[in-house]
């Protein structure tokens, strides 16, 4: 029977700069029941705080709701593991909410084949930003990436769409069924998961781009 091993805070993520969650990996348990607590202070403060919510983010997590989340403030956090034989502490982790945003995937991806009379046909897609993100505040610039592939192909073809919420693709294989997905990331932060796949059947008479 030993004191617990050193825990590690391995990830902090925010969906929208308004709330965030951090997760830790326990160290070895020393063969005894172990309690974990996350404490933090904000840079410039010495007032120590405890995690306000150990439930929302699941096991070994601390969730910071709206009232605990400050933009422009660096959080300095540490996890304490304690059992009957002693304690151990994680390294301090410095967290700035601005840099840990991982949005939800974009919504309402729609894909259509457009066949104008006077131009080459193309695949047109549009989508909406995730609902948790309020782009009107100007706090966010969201960038988008699209990927698509024929249903049976192994390789994805990826296109960067910048800040647009619509995109055209000209080069497609006629008669194929395509899977299309979109994802987004803030200017500072992490890519979202890919949106659910949307399927589109390319007509056999679709003319390939020269």
């Amino acid at each position: 029977q030993l004191p617990p091993g050193k825990p590690e805070i391995f990830k902090c993520r925010s969906p929208n700069k308004e709330t965030f969650t951090c997760w830790w990996r326990p160290g070895t348990d020393g063969g005894l029941p172990t309690n974990y607590s996350l404490t933090y202070h904000r840079e410039g403060e010495t007032l120590m705080h405890e995690c306000p919510d150990y439930i929302t983010g699941g096991p070994n997590s601390c969730h910071f709701g709206k009232q605990y989340t400050s933009m422009w403030r660096t959080y300095v956090m540490m996890v304490n593991a304690t059992n009957q034989m002693g304690s151990s502490f994680s390294d301090e982790l410095y967290v700035d909410v601005t840099y840990i945003v991982q949005p939800d995937p974009p919504l309402e991806l729609t894909v259509e084949v457009k066949q104008p009379e006077d131009r080459k046909p193309y695949l047109w897609m549009k989508w909406s930003p995730p609902t948790l993100i309020d782009l009107k505040t100007g706090w966010f610039t969201l960038l988008y990436e699209i990927r698509l592939k024929p249903e049976k192909a192994a390789e994805w073809e990826t296109h960067f769409a910048g800040q647009q919420t619509e995109f055209k693709i000209l080069s497609l294989h006629p008669g194929q069924k395509y899977l299309v997905q979109v994802r987004c990331k803030p200017d500072h932060g992490y890519w979202s998961a890919w949106s659910p796949a949307t399927f589109i059947q390319i007509p056999s008479d679709f003319i390939m781009n020269d």
């Epitope: 607590s37 403060e45 010495t46 007032l47 405890e50 995690c51 709701g65 709206k66 009232q67």
Partner: antibody, heavy 118, light 107 residues
């Protein structure tokens, strides 16, 4: 409605003891850090104690250190202040105050009066 | 411990006047400063935090400024309902010290 209600004040002799209670309702008490602030008659506000959400971190003002104890019972949504070795200068209205997530007192109770006199 | 000094300790001004209260910290506290209003016989009420962020529901005639050691609370146009004592408070570390208060009255 978010509310804090203090009780337990009264008249006590110097050297005596008193326990103040603060009952919280309308919010998730266990997620918030809590404080006691007092105000002597005709005087300003004086912060006297802080307790973190699960009770692991506690701070006291020098004026009460060693005489007063702050503690909480999250199951009962209650905050307490055990006051021992009371002095005349402890006479004041005692407020419990919720510390918001950005460390300011956003909700206050109505206060309970403590009078220390022989 | 860091001391918070408010000035003036009291002032009298006319309705519509611009009123400024100052608060000085004995050491730098970044912008970890709040202002509270306490009307006679009432409980203190939060006005401003992070030195300049207006608490929800507080009239826009109240504003805060400053950083480091020197801070101000300004009432742009004094109203009869603003008669109160105003307190600054630092909250970057314990003790969470209040200033001595400034009593604002109407002439």
């Amino acid at each position: 409605e978010v509310q804090l209600v203090e009780s337990g004040g009264g008249l006590v002799q110097p050297g005596g003891s008193l326990r103040l209670s603060c009952a919280a309702s309308g919010f998730t008490f266990s997620s918030y850090e809590m404080n006691w602030v007092r105000q002597a008659p005709g005087k300003g506000l004086e912060w006297i104690s802080y307790i973190s959400s699960r009770g692991g971190t506690i701070y006291y003002a020098d004026s009460i250190k060693g005489r007063f104890t702050i503690y909480r019972d999250n199951a009962r949504n209650s905050l307490y202040l055990q006051m021992n070795s009371l002095r005349a200068e402890d006479t004041a209205i005692y407020y419990c105050a919720r510390l918001s997530g950005v460390d300011i007192f956003d909700i206050w109770g109505q206060g309970t009066m403590v009078t220390v006199s022989s | 411990d860091i001391q918070m000094t408010q000035s003036p300790s009291s002032l009298s001004a006319s309705v519509g006047d611009r009123v400024t209260i100052t608060c000085r910290a004995s050491q730098g506290i970044s912008n970890y400063l709040a202002w509270y209003q306490q009307k006679p016989g009432k409980v203190p009420k939060l006005l401003i935090y992070f030195a300049s962020t207006l608490q929800s529901g507080v009239p826009s005639r109240f504003s805060g400024g400053g950083s480091g050691t020197d801070f101000t609370l300004t009432i742009s146009s004094l109203q009869p309902e603003d008669v109160a004592t105003y307190y600054c408070q630092r909250y970057n570390s314990a003790p969470l010290t209040f200033g001595g208060g400034t009593k604002v009255e109407i002439k």
